[in-house]
Amino acid sequence: APTSSSTKKTQLQLEHLLLDLQMILNGINNYKNPKLTRMLTFKFYMPKKATELKHLQCLEEELKPLEEVLNLAQSKNFHLRPRDLISNINVIVLELKGSETTFMCEYADETATIVEFLNRWITFCQSIISTLT
């Protein structure tokens, strides 16, 4: 059974992940057209279901494409290097989802833009955090 200290650690990690994802989204939302139009041609795959920490496998598998987009479309005003940012996210995701059980991610048929993708995982984090508090 999870202890209060492990629950607190999970909550803090989720809050950190949430902040990282929100930071990326805020950066993208500051982009103007036609740059935003170009960025929205990148497609991301969404999980069929995302209600448990193990479902973070689906986020982990899309981190490489996310880094690629951020590298290619990086604004000179965006001071965090995409590689460092994604590396931080990857470490948190690996800790949160655990490595004991191998979970095969199932993706929805529809693809998503980077904005929809980030919003989906932001909502996921907020939802799990709310169940822990």
Epitope: T41, L72, N77
Partner: antibody, heavy 121, light 113 residues
Framework: EVQLVQSGAEVKKPGESLKISCKGS????????IGWVRQMPGKGLEWMGT????????RYSPSFQGQVTFSADKSISTAYLQWSSLKASDTAMYYC??????????????WGQGTTVTVSS | DIVMTQTPLSLPVTPGEPASISCRSS????????????LDWYLQKPGQPPQLLIY???YRASGVPDRFSGSGSGTDFTLKISRVEAEDVGVYYC?????????FGGGTKVEIK
């Protein structure tokens, strides 16, 4: 080996329909836009538009909108270009080409060998 | 649509000598926020499909010899071949991909003198 293989040459009459194909292999076909390029006899290259096989999202160049249809079957890693009613002016070589995860951020790095379409009465 | 204009139309070259092709766009292909210039160069050898030579202004595509180089500013671009070889003959095209629809230049035919 990453490659795109196109269907063979076609000879058609005006008013007939046609569907040509472009099969990808050696990479994650669903994750890359596939562009279509026309080359009329003795002329230059014209970008017709592009399709994302992962969800069949299509973008047509205004010059080709309503003239052709792009489609894809991701289960067999194949993209298609079709005409419902061919005209003599559709006579050309048609190429498919891989355009990366975004057709804005990547050049066309892999090309099919081309399909010659001849429309004549 | 962005219009891409190439010069010259035809370029007779001598093997071992340098050659350059120009391309001009009707509007800037530079995104100053990103620092990306959305211009590519393709070579279509006789009887073959086009092949990507240079992407995003100056990056050589995989397997492309280093005798090919791309340069330029917002609207004026150059493809240089430091020492032309017989296998370099064909039609060279520039292409913009900063704006929809993507557009090609009319092509420059390079042939051996």
């Amino acid at each position: 080996e990453v490659q795109l293989v196109q269907s063979g040459a076609e000879v058609k009459k005006p008013g007939e329909s046609l569907k040509i194909s472009c099969k990808g292999s050696g990479y994650g076909f669903t994750n890359y836009w596939i562009g279509w390029v026309r080359q009329m006899p003795g002329k230059g290259l014209e970008w017709m538009g592009t399709i994302y096989p992962g969800d069949s999202d299509t973008r047509y160049s205004p010059s080709f909108q309503g003239q052709v249809t792009f489609s894809a079957d991701k289960s067999i890693s194949t993209a298609y270009l079709q005409w419902s009613s061919l005209k003599a002016s559709d006579t050309a070589m048609y190429y498919c080409a891989r355009q990366g995860r975004s057709y804005y951020y990547f050049g066309m790095d892999v090309w099919g060998q081309g399909t010659t379409v001849t429309v004549s009465s | 649509d962005i219009v891409m204009t190439q010069t010259p139309l035809s370029l007779p070259v001598t093997p071992g000598e340098p050659a350059s092709i120009s391309c001009r766009s009707s509007q800037s292909l530079l995104d100053s926020d990103e620092g990306n210039t959305f211009l590519d160069w393709y070579l279509q050898k006789p009887g073959q499909p086009p092949q990507l030579l240079i992407y995003t202004l100056s990056y050589r595509a995989s397997g492309v010899p280093d005798r090919f180089s791309g340069s330029g500013s917002g609207t004026d671009f150059t493809l240089k071949i430091s020492r032309v070889e017989a296998e370099d003959v064909g039609v060279y095209y520039c292409m913009q991909r900063i704006e929809f629809p993507l557009t090609f230049g009319g092509g420059t035919k390079v042939e051996i003198k």
